[in-house]
Amino acid sequence: SIPWNLERIIPAWHQTEEDRSPDGSSQVEVYLLDTSIQGAHREIEGRVTITDFNSVPEEDGTRFHRQASKCDSHGTHLAGVVSGRDAGVAKGTSLHSLRVLNCQGKGTVSGTLIGLEFIRKSQLIQPSGPLVVLLPLAGGYSRILNAACRHLARTGVVLVAAAGNFRDDACLYSPASAPEVITVGATNAQDQPVTLGTLGTNFGRCVDLFAPGKDIIGASSDCSTCFMSQSGTSQAAAHVAGIVARMLSREPTLTLAELRQRLIHFSTKDVINMAWFPEDQQVLTPNLVATLPPSTHETGGQLLCRTVWSAHSGPTRTATATARCAPEEELLSCSSFSRSGRRRGDWIEAIGGQQVCKALNAFGGEGVYAVARCCLVPRANCSIHNTPAARAGLETHVHCHQKDHVLTGCSFHWEVEDLSVRRQPALRSRRQPGQCVGHQAASVYASCCHAPGLECKIKEHGISGPSEQVTVACEAGWTLTGCNVLPGASLTLGAYSVDNLCVARVHDTARADRTSGEATVAAAICCRSRPSAKASWVQ
Amino acid sequence: QDEDGDYEELMLALPSQEDGLADEAAHVATATFRRCSKEAWRLPGTYIVVLMEETQRLQIEQTAHRLQTRAARRGYVIKVLHIFYDLFPGFLVKMSSDLLGLALKLPHVEYIEEDSFVFAQ
């Protein structure tokens, strides 16, 4: 009788196997920043080191009574979820606990920073195997807490954080909003978002994925073999920390970018009912529930991509939105999306040596999102080719002219403010293979990449009749790298990628104006990596 | 997240010269003060002074010491609770909010963040 949460995240073929690093020892270490814990609990005894680190605020209230089992409750449960002998995700993993939350579950940003610095110092004094840091806590948005997470992540530490239990945008909380942490929302046994009283799991673009977080059985500090169930995004984050520990145990050299991409790629997709989230957050929130991925040896050199949404630009006329990939990832395409449809397109530019995806709001628009497609392409050499806007009535063509470079994405940016005079840009997969084609007043950007065995092709799907969205998916074995909306309705909201699906959105009011001849087309660029092959464009 | 969401960033209005001290007037404050948007979660009186990324170890200590010295001239006692060396350059200080203007004008200061609560989730 395995708890539901373990059954959910650990596929049947993993249930009995032990994860061991190549040399036979499990050297992954998980650092837990939480309450004090009961180290003598049978679930974690012998695998937990209770550090002498303690940085907590005083408990509130003059009559507060410190009861050890209550003080240890949250941390003990999470330690059990990560590495408990019976109810843990990564049963052999050694854990270090740092006390940053008091008996009431309260801590401070400064205490958390000192804790993170303690981990960094430990790492410098005694370098060890892979480190995972679990942050099952949240406070308001903190620039310094996010910066500290970024600095620690850049030393090779993998940070996993709770999205927060405020039924709110996770981007408003830290460390959940730090791009360098893996941020985890909570789902229940029915794979639905967790409700906690009047609140529930946080959501939005700062959440990387969801994991079990309702009625999770784990070690209870009430006795040394006791169990209890707890709920929250802390429990969800603990599951992902356990999964990451198991992944690193098998393959200690996996980087943060690889871990995140693999977690996303192998998660269970489209099981969450998105209607639970506010309407404006549904498109930004990942419909992903974590599962333990197979090792890279079993899955080969698959091309892995994820979608990164920018913050909302805001409604000012020249407002721009910027979406960034992680340092190790390649930005293979950039698109944009606006709920009002008033946008002036998107482009890729280099900022501080890194390619970023930008989107521009249009006059009267409520704001835009930039949508980056971030991929892991080993030994990639990517560049951007752009052509300024053509004169009225002429098309602008951009293709990848360097030898062995393939088109992975197109972006279009309109110089004109008047949305009615311009036509939508287009990709042409038949007449001009591997080209981005723009219409009136559009600057066109082609993202071109060379990597061993990288091959790409365009796949289009058009709908003439009324439709709020048009989708096209890349087939099995291919990965979506670029997604655009092609001419059709007078007003499109933009395009974005959801896993391997390219979604082109059309404005509601545009449906009525449309004649049957004007097809709205979703155009996907699908790529795959075949290490033995040469880079090529597939027609 | 790259942008600072629902977050309070305050540029404190500062006179060009304070108490006629030339060394302080020389440095115009470009640093910002930040605090949690949720008032109930704020911890006024405790501040994280974050220094520019390239700030050297000795400069961190000097900056903290300089703040203590200048505060003392004004009759304030401040307590440096922790110095950050390994993750970012900076220090944690317990002081009156009256001293924020002074602290923001110190050399090497990038921003100051008021401490705030975090909670078990």
Epitope: H41, R42, E43, C226, F227 | -
Partner: antibody, heavy 118, light 108 residues
Framework: QVQLLESGGGLVQPGGSLRLSCKAS????????FTWVRQAPGKGLEWIGW????????RYNEKFKGKATISRDNSKNTLYLQMNSLRAEDTAVYYC???????????WGQGTLVTVSS | EIVLTQSPATLSLSPGERATITCRAS??????LNWYQQKPGQAPRLLIY???NRATGIPARFSGSGSGTDFTLTISSLEPEDFAVYYC??????????FGGGTKVEIK
């Protein structure tokens, strides 16, 4: 060889008291945790309480609070159970056992029969 | 409070037969469950600890399995000396020691 030997059982009048002893041998007594368990004729096992090896703290089954008192004398390697206000339903075989909390009750005494009857 | 339910209450078997006793916990207990054997007129004796580990000196015909809430004690081939009462036991917060009601294995 670890051994636990109970004594002090016998016939007691209702409302009376008695003190049971459990003498341990074969290991360092002061570092061990001990518990008392009883078994009424033809019935199952019922936990009474224990004494902690570290601080000598005691813990009791709610049912026995105020009725049972557990103590130990490390110099004599002996564990005690004081029972007060005895009634007919307290008739049982009383066992002492060594425990390691969260693990098991690995060594048991042979038991001593207490009969409460007028 | 955890409740341990043993079944069957009585098991009538012949020597050489296989005996299977189950113990169900009212809530999740991981693998932290013990089995004891009690022969008439004797004290209980630890048989299996942590659901599946045989205690010192216990013959290999005794085995334990299960985790979570459902546990099984199996005697692969009954010997005459195995006819006794068997108890399962777990730890809890209050009371900390909990026993099952017992299963009597008797000669058919």
């Amino acid at each position: 060889q670890v051994q636990l030997l109970e004594s002090g059982g016998g016939l007691v009048q209702p409302g009376g008291s008695l003190r049971l002893s459990c003498k341990a041998s074969g290991y360092t007594f002061s570092r061990q945790g001990f518990t008392w368990v009883r078994q009424a004729p033809g019935k199952g096992l019922e936990w009474i309480g224990w004494i902690d090896p570290g601080n000598g703290g005691t813990r009791y089954n709610e049912k026995f609070k105020g009725k049972a008192t557990i103590s130990r004398d490390n110099s004599k390697n002996t564990l005690y159970l004081q029972m007060n206000s005895l009634r007919a339903e307290d008739t049982a075989v009383y066992y002492c056992a060594r425990y390691r909390v969260g693990y098991s009750l690995d060594y048991w005494g042979q038991g001593t029969l207490v009969t409460v009857s007028s | 409070e955890i409740v341990l339910t043993q079944s069957p209450a009585t098991l009538s078997l012949s020597p050489g037969e296989r005996a299977t006793i189950t113990c169900r916990a009212s809530q999740y207990v991981g693998s932290y469950l013990n089995w004891y054997q009690q022969k008439p007129g004797q004290a209980p004796r630890l048989l299996i600890y942590d659901a599946s580990n045989r205690a010192t000196g216990i013959p290999a015909r005794f085995s334990g399995s299960g985790s979570g809430t459902d546990f099984t004690l199996t005697i692969s081939s009954l010997e005459p000396e195995d006819f006794a009462v068997y108890y399962c036991q777990v730890w809890d917060s209050s009371p900390p020691v909990v026993f099952g009601g017992g299963t009597k294995v008797e000669i058919k």
